[in-house]
């Protein structure tokens, strides 16, 4: 895909920069596995630049490719309390809305760790709603160091 | 925030680029938990290019939002040596000075593993020191593909 | 490493952008610890723009500094299938390729987890090819959410 | 419990070629946590270290030894071997292979030792 | 290459007694550094790992303590099966080197 002619002479912003890193607010209720997300530099180091929230989850608005990364770290929590459940706590996200797009783009269980970190490269578009669904009944930790999500613009 | 008229006109490098590998040196003497780290194309893939290092910690010399990543790998080391202490060993990312900036960018612990892998995106300002903490008496590998942290300069 | 004028003149595309998100496709026969990739917007979310495939391994085709990640989860997994073995389960990245640049770039082992994520900066040259080792005898899950391998070009 | 044994000539005339093979038992070498390494020992004198081997092939050697040794890794047999070329007099030790962790050089599983002597 | 400096070379002691043997390095090691011990016909055997770490089935009257390029190993109350050769390693850079051995015999 290559840049058109009106890209490569608008100035660099015009191509993307679209960027967040956000900080967890709450969970959802229950029957809710979703993770509730907020950002903003009031807030600490958590900033949106492009994308925005819709009731605590992350929108694209403009459309490439993304880094996506995220941590979470369980609250209370040993080896023996992840393990001891039957199903482990697992993290996904995933593309939630629009329906017709939506897909997992990440996932990771816990086992016997108390905190997931991983990241991916994926084509993102205008209107995508980024989900994080924690299944279980460990709760995240809410510390902004621990648990946090983001997104980066890389290329068209 | 936007990028200025003088910005858009600069050649690309002006905007940042910068970008640093470190791999681990040392670690600190007793009552020291920080990791001393190196970096340059004589000791092998590391490098520095914009970021400095003071007495083995990371000076940033460019404001804007970076993506900050770290593995740490611990050198002697089982599932049960890392369960059998009562504090897990746990390692932090963070400004250290200016003491008015100082604070916790990334946390993990290890619990019953041997590596921690993480990233975010945080904003950080010229003359920020990261410093990253391995709390507990496990000493961490030395090996450059298992131990590194680096830094990249996303965006202004 | 400054950017030459004719760089800096030159449209955005050709200072890079080169990047690529790969899923497995299988894994080698035996005593050949290799994982084969694949990537393509007909198999799904991944793709190549700008490095190859040769034989599922990945080739890069331009010079710079890439910031190369996976993740990698075990297909039948539990914390007591990982600890029961002798040897933890590994997963290493490195150039296998031309044989004198030959290097571990990034290794994990699993021990109680199921799944490894990383990432890291390190320079590659036009040529290299990179080979994901993964030894034991766990099998990694094709899942395109829990097993995937990219790279993004960042600076020349 | 993992075992090592070295296996190879006892006597070797100087100016040849030293070639030792260590082979593992009850653990693979085909592990991404091990180096497999030389060790020797003059008579009466102390440890140095020769090199070591990784599974796939990737070594390190003792740069006083490097112009002169050779390793190779045989998956399919779990053994690895150790060739020094020209040898003289002051090459005769007792040769032990052992393992090491791959994060960290910890000497932890060793051969019983094999005596090599170099006399024509 | 790191040299490793043993020291004394060789000591003769009683059983019960406290034996304290001093390893030196070239150049700082942190805390990548281990200690064996090699009787007649035998391989070495590890004793200490990470300067102070006691090796999983070693007696506690085994100690070792220091970092960067002094290093001490002790042991508390010399025992019949302690007569042997004891030897320092470094873990912190290629080539590994280990130091010339120090021989604790029977006074």
């Known amino acids: 895909q290559r840049l058109s002619r009106a890209q490569q002479q608008l100035p660099l912003e015009s191509l993307g920069w679209d960027i967040a890193e956000l900080q967890l607010n709450h969970t959802g209720p229950q029957q809710d596995p979703r993770l509730y997300w907020q950002g903003g530099p009031a807030l600490g180091r958590s900033f949106l630049r492009g994308p925005e929230l819709d009731k605590g989850q992350l929108r694209i608005r403009r459309d490439g490719i993304y880094m996506v990364h995220i941590q979470v770290t369980l609250a209370i929590c040993s080896s023996t309390s992840t393990s001891r459940h039957h199903h482990p706590t697992t993290l996904a996200v995933g593309i939630c809305s629009p329906a017709s797009r939506s897909i997992s783009l990440l996932r990771l269980s816990f086992h016997q760790g108390c905190t997931i970190a991983s990241q991916r490269l994926t084509p993102l578009a205008r209107g995508d709603t980024l989900c994080t669904n924690l299944t279980g009944t460990l709760l995240p930790s809410r510390n902004t160091d621990e648990t946090f999500f983001g997104v980066q613009w890389v290329r068209p | 925030q936007r990028l200025s008229r003088a910005q858009q006109q600069l050649p690309l490098e002006s905007l940042g680029w910068d970008i640093a590998e470190l791999q681990l040196n040392h670690t600190g003497p007793q009552q020291d938990p920080r990791l001393y780290w190196q970096g340059g194309p004589a000791l092998g893939r590391s490098f520095l290019r914009g970021p400095e290092l003071d007495k083995g910690q990371l000076r940033i010399r460019r404001d804007g939002i970076y993506m900050v990543h770290i593995q740490v790998t611990l050198a002697i080391c089982s599932s049960t040596s890392t369960s059998r202490h009562h504090h897990p060993t746990t390692l932090a990312v963070g400004i250290c000075s200016p003491a008015s900036r100082s604070i916790s960018l990334l946390r993990l612990s290890f619990h019953q593993g041997c590596t921690i892998a993480s990233q975010r995106l945080t904003p950080l300002a010229r003359g920020d020191t990261l410093c990253t903490n391995l709390t507990g008496t496990l000493l961490p590998s030395r090996n450059t593909d298992e131990t590194f942290f680096g830094v990249q300069w996303v965006r202004p | 490493q400054r950017l030459s004028r004719a760089q800096q003149q030159l449209p955005l595309e050709s200072l890079g952008w080169d990047i690529a998100e790969l899923q497995l496709n299988h894994t080698g026969p035996q005593q050949d610890p290799r994982l084969y990739w694949q990537g393509g917007p007909a198999l799904g979310r991944s793709f190549l723009r700008g490095p190859e495939l040769d034989k599922g391994q990945l080739r890069i085709r331009r010079d710079g500094i890439y910031m190369v990640h996976i993740q990698v989860t075990l297909a039948i997994c539990s914390s007591t299938s990982t600890s029961r073995h002798h040897h933890p389960t590994t997963l290493a990245v490195g150039i296998c390729s031309p044989a004198s640049r030959s290097i571990s770039l990034l290794r994990l082992s699993f021990h109680q987890g199921c799944t490894i994520a990383s990432q890291r900066l390190t320079p590659l040259a036009r040529g290299d090819t990179l080979c994901t080792n993964l030894t034991g005898t766990l099998l990694p899950s094709r899942n395109t959410d829990e097993t995937f391998f990219g790279v993004q070009w960042v600076r020349p | 419990q993992m075992q090592l044994q070295e296996s190879g000539p006892g006597l070797v005339k100087p100016s040849q070629t030293l070639s030792l093979t260590c082979t593992v038992s009850?653990?693979?070498?085909?592990?991404?946590?091990?180096?497999w390494s030389w060790i020797r020992q003059h008579p009466g004198k102390g440890l140095e270290w020769i090199g070591y081997i990784y599974y796939s092939g990737s070594t390190s050697y003792n740069p006083s030894l490097k112009s002169r040794l050779t390793m190779s890794v045989d998956t399919s047999k779990n053994q690895f071997s150790l060739k020094l070329s020209s040898v003289t007099a002051a090459d005769t030790a007792v040769y032990y292979c052992?393992?090491?962790?791959?994060?960290?050089?910890?000497?932890?599983?060793w051969g019983q030792g094999t005596l090599v002597t170099v006399s024509s | 290459d790191i040299q490793m400096t043993q020291s004394p070379s060789s000591l003769s002691a009683s059983l019960g007694d406290r034996v304290t043997i001093t390893c030196r390095a070239s150049?700082?090691?942190?805390?990548?550094f281990n200690w064996y011990q090699q009787k007649p016909g035998k391989a070495p055997k590890v004793l200490i790992f990470a300067a102070s770490s006691l090796q999983s089935g070693v007696p506690s009257r085994f100690g070792g303590s220091g970092s960067g390029t002094d290093f001490t190993l002790t042991i508390s109350s010399l025992q019949p099966e302690d007569f042997a050769t004891y030897y320092c390693q470094q873990s912190y850079s290629t080539p590994w080197t280990f130091g010339q051995g120090t021989k604790v015999e029977v006074k």
């Open positions: 150049q700082s090691v942190d805390r990548y």
């Open positions: 052992a393992r090491s962790g791959y994060s960290y050089a910890l000497f932890d599983y």
């Open positions: 009850d653990g693979s070498i085909i592990s991404g946590v091990y180096y």
